[in-house]
């Protein structure tokens, strides 16, 4: 059950009516109210398991629970995506799936969970203590990442027991940008509502734009907000660094999605029925996502924090428990 915060288009005021401020104060509270009501704290989970049939084959499963809509999932290994991790796969709900060796099969299991199977042979194969991370970019919560690994003592075919403490990281830009804006927005909304009691409400103008209104951009983080929070960073130590996958990564910029077959690009697939649950269209994300792919072109995925929804500040990261806590 994912709610999407649809935001009405901001219209220029009709001449001779309320004027710009009157109209903006009418629309903005609803925008902010929608965001205030739908915002929660997402949970991200990661499961790493070694397949009993192929001892060096891994399956990584990741899920996202939140009220927002997922716009991108990035799976990496060797650490978080923004902290030196190597991208294994990128899954977009509409534009499809891109994966790099040793990833064998990445797919949507449901609208909110994905799985990735890794090949077990060759120089770039993972080892038992490799850390795998999943980053979910969503609106309006921002970007959330959780990590997990398979303890060396695990029996093949069993998933990791809940003893290790994988990492969960919510990008500071996401947290500060979204939370800050929402907090400010909620306060501002209360202020507006209080002021509204003391004067008559302006008349609502009918919207003359298309019904597919753009989503509010209030969640794009400011540079100032990114620098404000500092959390202790614990490095992930992996004695088994993946091989550099230079040859596997295209450097072609945003058009790399275009090479996907169209049948792979549309819907998250269920494990039984591969076309069971289509994801609703998210046309309003296009401008943000175009920026994302442009960024991907400048910085190929394996070089670090390319393909993140928000710019990763060079600041520290938090070491967290197994449950996607921030």
């Amino acid at each position: 059950m994912r709610t999407e915060a649809q935001v009405p288009a901001l219209q220029p005021p009709e001449p001779g009516l309320e004027g710009a401020m009157g109209h903006r104060t009418l629309v903005l509270p609803w925008v902010l109210l929608t965001l205030c009501v739908t915002a929660g704290t997402p949970e991200v989970w990661v499961q790493v398991r070694m397949e009993a049939t192929e001892l060096s084959s891994f399956t990584i499963r990741c899920g996202f629970l939140g009220s927002g809509s997922i716009s991108l999932v990035t799976v990496s290994w060797g650490g978080p995506n923004g902290a030196g991790g190597t991208t294994l796969a990128v899954l977009h709900p509409e534009r499809g799936i891109r994966q790099w060796a040793p990833a064998r099969q990445a797919r949507w299991e449901t609208q909110s969970s994905i799985s990735l199977i890794l090949e077990g042979s060759g120089a770039s194969s993972p080892c038992a203590n490799t850390t795998f991370c999943c980053k979910f970019a969503s609106f309006p919560e921002g970007s959330w990442e959780a990590c997990g690994s398979l303890p060396p003592s695990s029996d093949p075919g069993l998933s990791a027991p809940p003893t290790p403490a994988p990492i969960l990281r919510a990008d500071l830009a996401g947290i500060l940008g979204v939370s800050g804006v929402l907090l400010f927005g909620c306060v501002y909304l209360l202020h507006l509502l209080r002021r509204h009691k003391h004067r008559p409400a302006p008349r609502l103008q009918p919207s003359r734009t298309s019904p597919q209104a753009p989503r509010a951009r209030a969640w794009a983080p400011s540079q100032a907000s990114q620098a404000a929070l500092h959390v202790p960073y614990a490095t992930i130590n992996t004695s088994c660094r993946p091989a550099t996958l230079d040859t596997a990564h295209p450097h072609g910029g945003p058009s790399w999605w275009a090479s996907l077959p169209t049948h792979a690009a549309h819907r998250p697939q269920g494990p039984a029925a591969w076309a069971s649950t289509p994801i609703p269209a998210r046309g309003s994300f296009v401008s943000v996502e175009n920026g994302l792919y442009a960024q991907a072109g400048e910085r190929p995925p394996h070089t670090g924090p390319g393909l993140t929804l928000f710019p990763d500040p060079r600041g520290p990261r938090a070491m967290e428990g197994p449950l996607g806590v921030r």
Epitope: M1, T110, S113, G148, S276, V325
Partner: antibody
Framework: QVQLQESGTELVKPGASVKLSCKAS????????IHWVKQRPGQGLEWIGN????????NYNEKFKSKAALTVDKSSSTAYMQLSSLTSEDSAVYYC???????????WGQGTTLTVSS | DIVMTQSQKFMSTSVGDRVSVTCKGS??????VAWYQQKPGQSPKALVY???DRHSGVPDRFAGSGSGTDFTLTISNVQSEDLAEYFC?????????FGAGTKLELK
């Protein structure tokens, strides 16, 4: 070992409020989400919501949004659920549970029995 | 909300039997299902997560299977201590939802 110790039986009057507690021990409290679940006599389980002990972030079942308020006290490793405007429909056993890897409730409290009666 | 339907409220079995408890989701939940056992007057106990992974300490006579919308908890060689109520739960999306439960009774 991991334990979730819930507060004892509560008998309250309709319209009143009550605050149930869930004290965690045997693990790092701030590393695991705490969930709350309701079970009415002879009935199934209903998810109320969850809380992230490290920052107090919450998610609620829409059905319980105006009924329950979840909080934590990190210093005492305790999670709380305040239930307000109580009616007989709120009479139930309330469980707190820890979310384990990758996602299931690996440890549960013993449950708090709440009876709302005049 | 995703509805998890356990169509059989009660199931009769005998010690040593093999029994299958079923659960059906109203929409695709992938493998994001857990199973719990609850005995009268006790808290639920986790048996299976990710549809088929046994929780630590759970006897191997308990086995979960299924994906998408159809899930099964199979208890082979039923023991007297297995007579309890069994709940499925989806964790694919909020709100998390449970099945209504299936009570395992002696024939």
């Amino acid at each position: 070992q991991v334990q979730l110790q819930e507060s004892g039986t509560e008998l309250v009057k309709p319209g009143a409020s009550v605050k149930l507690s869930c004290k965690a021990s045997g693990y790092t409290f701030t590393s695991y989400w705490i969930h709350w679940v309701k079970q009415r006599p002879g009935q199934g389980l209903e998810w109320i919501g969850n809380i992230n002990p490290s920052n107090g972030g919450t998610n609620y079942n829409e059905k319980f949004k105006s009924k329950a308020a979840l909080t934590v006290d990190k210093s005492s490793s305790t999670a709380y659920m305040q239930l307000s405007s109580l009616t007989s429909e709120d009479s139930a056993v309330y469980y707190c549970a820890r979310r384990g890897l990758p996602y299931f409730f690996d440890y549960w409290g013993q449950g708090t029995t709440l009876t709302v009666s005049s | 909300d995703i509805v998890m339907t356990q169509s059989q409220k009660f199931m009769s079995t005998s010690v040593g039997d093999r029994v299958s408890v079923t659960c059906k989701g109203s929409q695709n939940v992938g493998y994001n299902v857990a199973w719990y056992q609850q005995k009268p007057g006790q808290s639920p106990k986790a048996l299976v997560y990710s549809a088929s992974d046994r929780h630590s300490g759970v006897p191997d006579r308990f086995a979960g299977s299924g994906s998408g919308t159809d899930f099964t908890l199979t208890i082979s060689n039923v023991q007297s201590e297995d007579l309890a109520e069994y709940f499925c739960q989806q964790y694919n999306s909020y709100p998390l939802t449970f099945g209504a439960g299936t009570k395992l009774e002696l024939k």
